[in-house]
C-alpha cells in the first residue's frame, strides 16, 4: 500500500512538473506575442504617419536630394536655434558639399534675400577648430571666411553665398535640416 501511495505521489509530482513547464512555455509565448505586438504597433504607427504625409518633406520645407530644409521666419541665438530644430525632428544645417552650399544660397536668394542664417557650425573653445554640431570637421572649402573677433563663443552662419562667423549670442534666422522620407516603392 505504501508503494502504491509512493507511486501516486511520484505521478502527481511528474504531472505538476509538466504543468509548470507548460505554464512557463505559455508565459514565454505570451511575452513573445506582446513583444511582436509592440513592434507591429510601432511599424503601423510609422507606416501610418508616412502614409498620412506621403511627400518627402513636411509643408514649408524645401527638398534637395535626400534632405529637407526649413528656413526660419524668426530670429534666435545659435543655441536656441539648435533647440528649435530638434523640436521639429531636425538639426541645424550641416553643409556637406559645395553643391549643397550652392543649393542653399540659391534658395535663400529666392526666398528672403541677403540675411544671416545660423548653421550647425561652431568653434571649439579650446582648440579653435571649427566643428559641426555632431562633432565632425567641415571640409576645407567649407570653413568660415572671416574669424570673429569676439571673445565669446563663435558660431557659423550663411549670408549671401558665404559662410561667416559671429558671436553665438547674436540674433539671426536659422536653417534646419532633416532626412527626406524615402518613398517605399
Amino acid at each position: 500500500k505504501l508503494l502504491q501511495v509512493s507511486t501516486i505521489a511520484m505521478q502527481q509530482q511528474e504531472k505538476l512538473i509538466q504543468q509548470e513547464r507548460a505554464l512557463l512555455n505559455f508565459t514565454e509565448w505570451k511575452r513573445s506575442c506582446a513583444l511582436q505586438m509592440k513592434y507591429c504597433q510601432a511599424f503601423m504607427q510609422n507606416s501610418l504617419s508616412s502614409a498620412h504625409n506621403s511627400s518627402p518633406c513636411p509643408n514649408n520645407w524645401i527638398q534637395n536630394r535626400e534632405s529637407c530644409y526649413y528656413v526660419s521666419e524668426i530670429w534666435s541665438i545659435w543655441h536656441t536655434s539648435q533647440e528649435n530644430c530638434l523640436k521639429e525632428g531636425s538639426t541645424l544645417l550641416q553643409i556637406e558639399s559645395k553643391e549643397e552650399m550652392d543649393f542653399i544660397t540659391g534658395s535663400l536668394r529666392k526666398i528672403k534675400g541677403s540675411y544671416d542664417y545660423w548653421v550647425g557650425l561652431s568653434q571649439d573653445g579650446h582648440s579653435g577648430r571649427w566643428l559641426w554640431q555632431d562633432g565632425s570637421s567641415p571640409s576645407p572649402g567649407l570653413l568660415p571666411a572671416e574669424r570673429s573677433q569676439s571673445a565669446n563663443q563663435v558660431c557659423g552662419y550663411v549670408k549671401s553665398n558665404s559662410l561667416l562667423s559671429s558671436n553665438c549670442s547674436t540674433w539671426k534666422y536659422f536653417i534646419c535640416e532633416k532626412y527626406a522620407l524615402r518613398s517605399s516603392v
Epitope: Q41, A42, S49, L86, E88, G89, S90, T91, Q133, K178
Partner: nanobody, 116 residues
Framework: QVQLQESGGGLVQAGGSLRLSCVAS????????MVWYRQSPGKQRELVAG???????TYANSVRGRFTVSRDIAKSTAYLQMNTLKPEDTAVYYC??????????WGQGTQVTVSS
C-alpha cells in the same frame, strides 16, 4: 502622453564616467527627438545633446567630444554616455521628448555630482 524615466546619475570624481538612461513609454522612433538637458543651481536650463527620430545627432559645444548620445529603439531608451567629467558638469540632468506636434514631455531628472 509620453512618460520618461531617467536613471544612472550619481556621485563621481572628476575625470570619471557615468551613463544616463531614459526609458520612454512609447516607441521612440516615432518621436521628433529625444533631448538631454541639464540645470545647475541658479543657472538656466541648457541643452546637452539630442537625437532626432531619424538618428541625426547634435551636441552642446561644452560637451562635444566628451559626451555621446545614443538610443536603442527596441528598448525605447535613449542614453547619454558622459566621459572625462568635470566639476562644472554637476547638475540635474533631464530627458525630454518632443512628439510629432513638437509638444515637450519631461522626465523627473537625475542628479549628477562631479567632485574635484
Amino acid at each position: 502622453q509620453v512618460q520618461l524615466q531617467e536613471s544612472g546619475g550619481g556621485l563621481v570624481q572628476a575625470g570619471g564616467s557615468l551613463r544616463l538612461s531614459c526609458v520612454a513609454s512609447v516607441n521612440i522612433g516615432s518621436l521628433n527627438s529625444m533631448v538631454w538637458y541639464r540645470q545647475s543651481p541658479g543657472k538656466q536650463r541648457e541643452l546637452v545633446a539630442g537625437i532626432t527620430g531619424s538618428g541625426q545627432i547634435t551636441y552642446a559645444n561644452s560637451v562635444r567630444g566628451r559626451f555621446t548620445v545614443s538610443r536603442d529603439i527596441a528598448k525605447s531608451t535613449a542614453y547619454l554616455q558622459m566621459n572625462t567629467l568635470k566639476p562644472e558638469d554637476t547638475a540635474v540632468y533631464y530627458c525630454a521628448a518632443y512628439d510629432r506636434s513638437a509638444t515637450a514631455y519631461w522626465g523627473q531628472g537625475t542628479q549628477v555630482t562631479v567632485s574635484s
